[in-house]
Amino acid sequence: TSSASSSSSSAPFLASAASAQPPLPDQCPALCECSEAARTVKCVNRNLTEVPTDLPLYVRNLFLTGNQLAVLPAGAFARRPPLAELAALNLSGSRLDEVRGGAFEHLPSLRQLDLSHNPLAYLSPFAFSGSNASISAPSPLVELILNHIVPPDDKRQNRSFEGMVAAALVAGRALQGLHLLELASNHFLYLPRDVLAQLPSLRYLDLSNNSLVSLTYVSFRNLTHLESLHLEDNALKVLHNGTLAELQGLPHVRVFLDNNPWVCDCHMADMVTWLKQTGVVQGKDRLTCAFPEKMRNRVLLELNSADLDCDPILPPSLQTS
């Protein structure tokens, strides 16, 4: 049998007992479960309001999910001696609404960070780079998971949410080694123009379940290592020649385009031609038209140029109201 990917650990855990004694380096914090054998600490669904100070030095995998952290300040995980082994940090669903600059400083081995399902009204531009230098020390992050971090409308800052996230991703060019970036379910209307150029090592990019209408101003040209591009469940109407050429030019990419409201008019002709000959689109036989009404549910691969027409635009003198 095959298995979908997962990252759960089945090692035994020791429930922590609260202690009046000063914490030992390898003691388990109150309200957490620890397994030294699995190098894992789980402080899950405990309504914690701050990161435990007494995390054991052996911790490699830290789960702080389902809490009430609210704010992650600078140096939230800085310890003496540092948590030098910490490689995977999961903070999903912990009611974070603010992640400040330098929140993840002094974690030299941090490879995977999951901030999903937190309504981030404020994400500092220096959350991942740790400093406001134009070129920062490279972050060790390889996987950054930011699904559903969009705050409710009434909690949004004045600037665009897309811009706020983009600023954090490009600051100091710190994330040049990032291989995986998940940005699904964030109501993105657009992808800021220069973000991908600053993430040249990306292999996996998930932008699914957003509200992207167009990729016209997005350049994938730099992403020569990209293996998976997920664009399912957006608001894409057509992919134009420039985008098609860039995607075709990426040597290893697989593109996922399911569940977009494709508009099958004369502007779709180039994309249909490309779909028929490309090997990069996964499940391309499932792509169907959403508009115009007469084309609804037609399979894109089965269309020919005669099917793809645009209603002529009448000169103003002949238009009727």
Partner: nanobody
């Protein structure tokens, strides 16, 4: 239910050959690119080779170029990896992979793996 079942692994001497197979079911095999990955003891899983839907395009890790060949038979729903001139450093568990959708939705499928040991 998506299933990927690898076979063909075993013990082989340096310089020898093996052919791995991956039988796929539960999805439209011909509509998806497929990959082989491997994981050696104490190392991270790495991409070995991948092939597009109709087999028109293939890619290989630098370490196996010229020695390994990936292919597919869409009529048989089977993915292959022909491994020639095997070296000790090719020793690993080899996995077949089908990515049918976002990883976060559990749509990145893996077989159970087949062990390849290259040793004299």
């Amino acid at each position: 239910e998506v299933q990927l079942v690898e076979s063909g692994g075993g013990l082989v001497q340096p310089g020898g050959s093996l052919r791995l197979s991956c039988a796929a079911s539960g999805f439209t095999f011909s509509s998806y690119a497929m990959s082989w990955y491997r994981q050696a003891p104490g190392k991270e899983r790495e991409l070995v080779a991948s092939i597009t839907t109709a087999g028109g395009s293939t890619r290989y890790a630098d370490s196996v170029k010229g020695r390994f060949t990936i292919s597919r038979d869409n009529a048989k729903n089977t993915l292959y990896l022909q491994m020639n001139s095997l070296r000790a450093e090719d020793t690993a568990v080899y996995y077949c992979n089908a990515e049918l959708g976002p990883r976060r939705l559990g749509m990145d499928y893996w077989g159970q793996g087949t062990l390849v040991t290259v040793s004299s």
